[in-house]
């Protein structure tokens, strides 16, 4: 006994088989890549009359894959799922088993088809083996049950009730048909679901409709100084076995950032990082920095913590500023000899302007290189000077200088000259070192002084007294120098003049 060729399949393949196809042979169907198999993949060659072979079931079909297909949860009263789980996509299968004392009619497996329906056959049914049946259940207002199209129900079957959107089930959700032919409970009812009033909303208010049925919206508003954190409205929705409001906002306090600091001034009031809405800060300027100068507040002295369009804490305006009232102060153009101004050159010098000086090459700056125009219109400190050291003062013949062994001769240094006894100073006795590094006036000279004789003469050279030697003396013809006498002369320090004598 053998079977004929297996039924063909569009967009699919049949596993290899050889002919004749003997009873007991299993052939398998499969689909091409983009197609899904709907139906049993295996066919068995059987015989019912022991004469001819026949295939035990129709061939499956291959459907073009529909990624959008989705089938509903299949329910078989008196049965349960033994294969398959949600979500059900195109080509997924579900297999059912019947509960004890129920027998199955139809195929135990169905497939999710491209049209979102279960197939290729209808869902199986599980039929009770008991004769007693429960009466048909009533429909419930605003709800449904799983046996709406069934006349009477066999013992062991369960009926599940559900309510339409916006209604809640009151009573038993599942009632069972007992073997006595009675229902295990009375049918439930569907009551309109109502949310509880939201009541007090901290730091704000809530506007809700008079009847709080499912689907209505409550709107939230915050008190001044608070802003909504979260959704501005909440909906009454079904949640599990009850109703609830969707996520509600909170009113959070609005804060301003720390008040902005100002130069030459300060604020009184709040200086925290977070300043509460409505807080006020007052700005004042620092005390007068010096006599004749004071700070003037320009702008609003008071700022308030307010909100912007985004409900963000912001100050009511910009911070004021503290400006010096020194517009009348003017300093003269600063001057420096043998130097130049290296920064701060201007046509006009006003309060707090500064200039910096430098000296010409070879000159040294004496004083502060930087000076400032003060409130009195004078430069502070006074302008520096550029000066040069003098060379050591020259020595003079027949005289000496009083330099106390100095090695440096800064401008302003004064040196005194004096002449030896018997000599007189011609010129100024003191010279000064000028800023240009030059001695002034010219160095004096020591000239031979005339002797104002005292009338005292010595024949021997005095010891420890100044004696001006006679260097120019000469004798007339027929005479020669011989010996000396010493004539005392008047002076600050008495001194002696040598007089040479001539003899024949």
């Amino acid at each position: 006994i053998s079977c004929g060729s297996p039924p063909p399949i569009l967009n699919g393949r049949i596993s290899y088989y050889s002919t004749p196809i003997a009873v007991g042979t299993v052939i398998r169907y499969s689909c091409s890549g983009t197609f899904r198999l709907i139906g049993e993949k295996s066919l068995l060659c059987i015989t019912k009359d022991k004469v001819d072979g026949t295939w035990d079931k129709p061939a499956p079909k291959c459907e073009y894959f529909n990624k959008y297909s989705s089938c509903p949860e299949p329910i078989v009263p008196g049965g349960y799922k033994i294969r398959g789980s949600t979500p059900y996509r195109h080509g997924d299968s579900v297999t059912f088993a019947c509960k004890t004392n129920f027998s199955m009619n139809g195929n135990k497996s169905v497939w999710c088809q491209a049209n979102n329906m279960w197939g290729p056959t209808r869902l199986p049914t599980c039929v009770s083996v008991f004769p007693l049946e429960c009466p048909a259940l009533p429909m419930i207002h605003n709800g449904h049950h799983t046996s709406e199209n069934v006349g009477s129900i066999a013992p062991g079957l369960s009926v599940t009730y559900s309510c339409e959107s916006g209604y809640l089930l009151v009573g038993e959700k599942i009632i069972n048909c007992l073997s006595s032919g009675k229902w295990s409970a009375v049918p439930p009812t569907c009551e309109e679901a109502r949310c509880k009033s939201l009541g007090r909303f901290p730091n704000g208010k809530v506007k809700e409709p008079p009847i709080l049925r499912v689907g209505v919206t409550a709107n939230f508003f915050c008190d001044e100084g608070y802003r909504l954190q979260g959704p501005p409205s909440s909906r009454c929705v079904i949640a599990g076995q009850g109703v609830a409001w969707t996520k509600m906002p909170v009113c959070e306090e609005i804060f301003c950032p720390s008040p902005p600091p100002i130069l030459n001034g300060r604020h009184i009031g709040n200086s925290l990082a977070n300043v509460s809405y409505g807080s006020i800060v007052t700005y004042t300027c620092d005390p007068d920095p010096e006599e004749g100068v004071n700070f003037i507040l320009i702008g609003e002295s008071t700022l308030r913590c307010t909100v912007d369009s985004q409900k963000t804490g912001t100050w009511s305006g910009p911070a004021p500023r503290c400006e010096l009232s020194t517009s009348a102060v003017q300093c003269p153009h600063p001057q420096i000899l043998r130097g130049r101004m290296v920064s701060g050159q201007k046509d006009r010098y006003t309060y707090n302007d500064t200039v910096i000086f430098a000296c010409m090459f070879g000159f040294t700056l004496k004083g502060s290189k930087q000076i400032r125009c003060n409130a009195q219109g004078t430069w502070e400190p006074s302008a520096p000077v550029c000066e040069k050291e003098c060379q050591a003062p020259p020595n003079i013949l027949n005289g000496q200088k009083e330099d106390r062994h100095m090695v440096r001769f800064d401008p302003g240094t004064s040196i005194k000259y004096s002449c030896n006894p018997g000599y007189v100073l011609v010129g100024e006795e003191s010279i000064q070192c000028t800023s240009e590094g030059v001695w002034t006036p010219p160095v004096p000279q020591c000239k031979v002084a005339a002797c104002e004789a005292t009338g005292r003469q010595l024949l021997t050279k005095p010891q420890h007294q100044f004696v001006r030697p006679d260097v120019n003396s000469s004798c007339g013809e027929g005479y020669k120098l011989s010996g000396s006498v010493y004539q005392e002369c008047q002076g600050t320090i008495p001194w002696f003049m040598e007089i040479r004598l001539c003899k024949e």
Partner: antibody
């Protein structure tokens, strides 16, 4: 009355295979699903898979694909489970169970399989 | 797969005490079944379809829950109730909880 009688304890070597049986009585063998469940010593329960003896249809827990193979003999109302490539991890008690009403309402007494060299 | 988390893992109760075992589910299921197992014995069906007592189960036992949270309650603990209880869900692959070992004081 429904009764599920399982075969005796097995001591097997690593790498080998073992086939254990579950003889059913008291109900229509071909119309009910037979499940197999694993319980390691001191451990919980793990579902291996089922067989529908009426047409030989099977469903496995992916974890046991290639490890367990379920078959049934309608003539003797016996379900079988073959475990292959055995390791110490396969040492456990294996139960057959019937799901008459959508839960495991009848259980076999269990078979202890010990994998040891 | 759906993971069932039972708590507590072990517990000790005095006779007459009320005992509750919970089973949390990683994603919503329609029903929960419970089994009782005593040492060296096969598990027995105890509560099926969340709240129905299996044949021969004393009425001090009850089951409740929905979605992702289920529980088994013993209203008046007795010595014979000492056992390990497993929850089990019927979405494929079928999975069991890790068990709660209940001991008598």
């Amino acid at each position: 009355e429904v009764h599920l009688q399982q075969s005796g304890a097995e001591l097997v070597k690593p790498g080998s295979s073992v086939k254990i049986s579950c003889k059913a009585s008291g109900y229509t063998f071909t119309s009910n699903f037979m499940h197999w469940i694993k319980q390691q010593p001191g451990n919980g329960l793990e579902w291996i898979g089922w067989i529908y003896p009426g047409d030989g249809d099977t469903e496995y827990n992916q974890k046991f694909n290639g490890k367990a193979s379920l078959t049934a003999d309608k003539s003797s109302s016996t379900a079988y489970m073959q475990l292959s490539s055995l390791t110490s991890e396969d040492s456990a008690v294996y139960f057959c169970a019937l799901s008459g009403d959508g839960y495991f309402d009848y259980w076999g007494q269990g078979v202890m399989v010990t994998v040891s060299s | 797969e759906i993971v069932l988390t039972q708590s507590p893992t072990t517990m000790t109760a005095s006779p007459g005490e009320k005992v509750t075992i919970t089973c949390r589910v990683s994603s919503s299921v329609s029903y929960m079944h419970w089994y009782q197992q005593k040492p060296d014995a096969s598990p027995k069906p105890w509560i099926y379809e969340t709240s129905k007592l299996a044949s021969g189960v004393p009425d001090r036992f009850s089951g409740s829950g929905s979605g992702t949270s289920y529980s088994l309650t013993i209203n008046n603990m007795e010595a014979e109730d000492a056992a390990t209880y497993y929850c089990q869900q019927w979405n494929f692959p079928l999975t069991f909880g890790s068990g709660t070992k209940l001991e008598i004081k």
